[in-house]
Amino acid sequence: YDFTNCDFEKIKAAYLSTISKDLITYMSGTKSTEFNNTVSCSNRPHCLTEIQSLTFNPTAGCASLAKEMFAMKTKAALAIWCPGYSETQINATQAMKKRRKRKVTTNKCLEQVSQLQGLWRRFNRPLLKQQ
């Protein structure tokens, strides 16, 4: 999906009103020095691409983020503020239902959510002038 035509300000507002707080809750008890961000993004569409990938694609050691509250709210925000996004996700959702697993908070998941917080920071405040 090409995130170029999303309403970035509305997504930012959704993130700051609820999603950010859910991420903080998920990370509670984790030391702020624990994880170094290794995933970066250069502009808002790129940030949303990376955010989508980290939030919804299962990775080795962390298969369960898509069912977290922050993930569901992220999905809702993208569906509302990115034209045509929900249509592109139907097949992906069906595939995910087949491989749904119980929620387990692993260290790998905590690291992944730390990466997500960093990506959202860059989405909210891109360094590039044209943004």
Partner: antibody
């Protein structure tokens, strides 16, 4: 506990340069932007620029372009602001600050470094 | 650059009374406004981010509102410890800019 500790006061001659340091502790230094802001005596706050310590990306206020240089040393978790071609109007307190967890504000500030430019 | 204009530049308020500061942007900054307080002899401290969100530990007698170009910061009941200079800041466009500051004094 997050802390930003800045270097001590400096007295400089017009035309010279100054390099102010900002040592961060209590968080993953590479993950958060470091901002630089200055405040002339009795005046308001003026944004100088920002650096991403993770990759070295910077953005400067045009008023300081070519004179201000922001760098970061990940090995020591220290950010630096160098200002060249100093003039008397550069006499100010220089602050470093960290972006907050959402990327929309500055949540931790250094104690400030007084730079005095005088002949 | 986006110019942030604060009014009034100084305020003298009786403890327990309300206080209000206006901040107007020269062009729309959406909701990208932050409020800081600089107490005498100290570094600035974060109070409100993204127009109306309280930073951790900030009392709820402080509040922010507005969007676009017009923003307001309010203290419902001023206390002696609230003295200092209040600054609005926009982070919608580079360069980031601050208002001139509003000095709050206690009567």
């Amino acid at each position: 506990e997050v802390q930003l500790v800045q270097s001590g006061a400096e007295v400089k001659k017009p035309g010279s340069s100054v390099k102010v340091s900002c040592k961060a502790s209590g968080y993953a230094f590479s993950n958060y932007l470091i901002e630089w802001v200055r405040q002339a005596p009795g005046q308001g706050l003026e944004w100088i620029g920002v650096i991403d310590p993770g990759n070295g990306d910077t953005n400067y206020n045009e008023n300081f372009k070519g004179r201000a240089t922001l760098t970061a040393d990940k090995s020591t978790s220290t950010a630096y602001m160098e200002l060249s071609s100093l003039r008397s109007e550069d006499t100010a307190v220089y602050y470093c600050a960290r972006e907050d967890n959402t990327g929309t504000a500055f949540d931790y500030w250094g104690q400030g470094t007084t730079v005095t430019v005088s002949s | 650059s986006i110019v942030m204009t604060q009014t009034p530049l100084s305020l003298s308020v009786t403890p327990g009374q309300p206080a209000s500061i206006s901040c107007k942007a020269s062009q729309s900054v959406s909701s990208d406004v932050t409020w800081y307080l600089q107490k005498p002899g100290q570094s600035p401290q974060l109070l409100i981010y993204y127009v109306s969100n309280h930073y951790t530990g900030v009392p709820d007698r402080f509040s922010g509102s507005g969007s676009g170009t017009d923003f307001t910061f309010k203290i419902s009941r001023v206390e002696a410890e609230d003295v200092g200079v209040y600054y609005c800041q926009q982070h919608h466009r580079f360069p980031l800019t601050f208002g001139q500051g509003t000095k709050l004094e206690i009567k």
